[in-house]
Interface confidence: medium
C-alpha cells in the first residue's frame, strides 16, 4: 500500500552473500532402493548464497563451494524393532558468492 | 552411502530457531492492478523460524511474530521514462519459535 509511510524505515537490499539455511535430509540421499527406514537428524544447517544483486540480468551465485560429509543415523525398522546404522551424506556449503550475469538466449529472428 | 565414514563428522540437527532469510518483494504486494513498474530493492532480509524438532508429530513454528513496515521505491515506466514513487511493504519477522504438535487426523475406521 502507499499509506502509512512515516513509520516505515527504508528497505535495505538483502545483499548477495552466504547465509545459514536448513537442509532437509531426504531418504533417497541415503538409500533409493528401500523406504523402510528413517533418517536422524532430519535436517542440518548449510551455508548457501542468497540475496539480490544491484542490477537486472545478474543473479547471486556461489563462486566457491565445499563438500562436507556428515554422519547420520539410518534407522531401519525390522519386525517392529529399530536397527541403527551409520550413513554418510555429503552436504554442499557455499563459501563465497558473486553476482553473475545470466545469459538469456536471444530469440531467433 | 555407507562408505567413507571416517572423515565424516556426526550431523548436528538444525535446531528450531529464527534464522535470517531473504524475502523477494513481489510486485503484487504493492499494486495488483498494474504490472508496468519495478520495485527496489527486489529483496530484503527477514527473520524466520526454521529447523527441525527432536520428536515426531511436531513442527517448528513461530510463537511470536512482528510486522515491520518498510519503504520501497515503486519505479513506474511512463512513456519510456522512470517515475519514482514510495510504497510501503509490511514484512513479517518471527521473533520466537517453538516445536508445536501437529494434529494429524486419524483415519476413520
Amino acid at each position: 500500500s502507499l499509506g502509512s509511510l512515516a513509520a516505515a524505515e527504508p528497505a535495505v537490499i538483502a545483499e548477495c552473500k552466504t547465509r545459514t539455511e536448513v537442509f532437509q535430509i531426504s531418504r533417497n540421499l541415503i538409500d533409493r532402493t528401500n523406504a523402510n527406514f528413517l533418517v536422524w537428524p532430519p535436517c542440518v544447517e548449510v551455508q548457501r548464497c542468497s540475496g539480490c544483486c544491484n542490477n537486472r540480468n545478474v543473479q547471486c551465485r556461489a563462486s566457491q563451494v565445499q563438500m562436507r560429509p556428515v554422519q547420520v543415523r539410518k534407522i531401519e525398522i525390522v519386525r517392529k524393532k529399530p536397527v541403527f546404522k551409520k550413513a554418510t551424506v555429503t552436504l554442499e556449503d557455499h563459501l563465497a558468492c558473486k553476482c553473475e550475469t545470466v545469459v538469456t538466449p536471444r530469440p531467433v529472428t | 552411502s555407507l562408505g567413507s565414514l571416517a572423515a565424516a563428522e556426526p550431523a548436528v540437527i538444525a535446531e528450531c530457531k529464527t534464522r535470517t532469510e531473504v524475502f523477494q518483494i513481489s510486485r503484487n504486494l504493492i499494486d495488483r492492478t498494474n504490472a508496468n513498474f519495478l520495485v527496489w530493492p527486489p529483496c530484503v532480509e527477514v527473520q524466520r523460524c526454521s529447523g527441525c524438532c527432536n520428536n515426531r508429530n511436531v513442527q517448528c513454528r513461530a510463537s511470536q511474530v512482528q510486522m515491520r513496515p518498510v519503504q520501497v521505491r515503486k519505479i513506474e515506466i511512463v512513456r519510456k521514462k522512470p517515475v519514482f514513487k514510495k510504497a510501503t511493504v509490511t514484512l513479517e519477522d518471527h521473533l520466537a519459535c517453538k516445536c508445536e504438535t501437529v494434529v494429524t487426523p486419524r483415519p476413520v475406521t
Epitope: 536422524w40 524393532k81 529399530p82 | 565414514l5 556426526p10 515426531r56
Partner: antibody
C-alpha cells in the same frame, strides 16, 4: 528439575512377580524413548528393555524376553517394568533411563535406581 | 549375540592421558556412547555418538570410533575421574554395554 524416580523394588521369592515404576518430571515425557538398565551387585551394566515415545516399539534383552513387559502411561509421566517368573539372577539395581529422541539414542538421564532382590 | 569387550582395569598417573578401549565386530558402523559410574552413584553420560560431549562434561574427555575399536580418552586425568567406564552401542535390536573398565588414578 529434570529427574527420574524409580520405585517398586524389594525382596521377592523365585518365581514371583514385581512391578517397577519410574516417575518422570521436568521434561515432556511423551516425547522420548525410555529404557530399563540393571546392574547386579558388583557387576556391570546390562540393558533390559526399551520403549519408544508412543509405546509402539518395544524390545527386550534375551535374558528377560517372555518374562518382563515394559509399558508407559504418558498421561501419568510414568514408565513401568512388569517382572514375572523372577529368578535369582534377576537380582540387581534397576535403573530407568531417558533417551534424547523419540526413537532412542544415548541415555542422557538416569534415575537413582531401585534394588530388586530375588531370594528364598 | 553382539559383544563389546573392554579391559577390566586401566591405571594412570594424575595429569597423564588415560585411554580406554571398547572393541566389537565392525563397531565403527555403529554409534558408541560412554558412561561414567562412581561408587554408589547412577551412571552419567560422558561421550555420545562416538565423539560428542554433553554439556557439563569437561573438555578433557574425548572419544573416537573406527574399524572394530572405540576409544575413550581422558587427557590430564584428575583424581575425580576415578570411576568405572562403560561403552555402549545399539546393534541388532538391542542396546549392548561393554563389561566396564575400572579407571584407577594413581597417587
Amino acid at each position: 528439575e529434570v529427574q527420574l524416580l524409580e520405585s517398586g523394588g524389594g525382596l521377592v521369592q523365585p518365581g514371583g512377580s514385581l512391578r517397577l515404576s519410574c516417575a518422570a518430571s521436568g521434561f515432556t515425557f511423551s516425547s522420548y524413548a525410555m529404557s530399563w538398565v540393571r546392574q547386579a551387585p558388583g557387576k556391570g551394566l546390562e540393558w533390559v528393555s526399551y520403549i519408544s515415545d508412543d509405546g509402539s516399539l518395544k524390545y527386550y534383552a534375551d535374558s528377560v524376553k517372555g518374562r518382563f513387559t515394559i509399558s508407559r502411561d504418558n498421561s501419568k509421566n510414568t514408565l513401568y517394568l512388569q517382572m514375572n517368573s523372577l529368578r535369582a539372577e534377576d537380582t540387581a539395581v534397576y535403573y530407568c533411563a531417558k533417551h534424547p529422541y523419540w526413537y532412542g539414542g544415548q541415555l542422557d538421564l538416569w534415575g537413582q535406581g531401585t534394588l530388586v532382590t530375588v531370594s528364598s | 549375540s553382539y559383544e563389546l569387550t573392554q579391559p577390566p582395569s586401566v591405571s594412570v598417573s594424575p595429569g597423564q592421558t588415560a585411554s580406554i578401549t571398547c572393541s566389537g565386530d565392525s563397531l565403527g558402523s555403529y554409534f558408541v556412547h560412554w558412561y561414567q559410574q562412581k561408587p554408589g552413584q547412577s551412571p552419567v553420560l560422558v561421550i555420545y555418538d562416538d565423539s560428542n560431549r554433553p554439556s557439563g562434561i569437561p573438555e578433557r574427555f574425548s572419544g573416537s570410533n573406527s574399524g572394530n575399536t572405540a576409544t575413550l580418552t581422558i587427557s590430564g586425568t584428575q583424581a575425580m575421574d576415578e570411576a568405572d567406564y562403560y561403552c555402549s552401542a545399539f546393534t541388532h535390536n538391542s542396546d549392548v554395554f561393554g563389561g566396564g573398565t575400572k579407571l584407577t588414578v594413581l597417587g
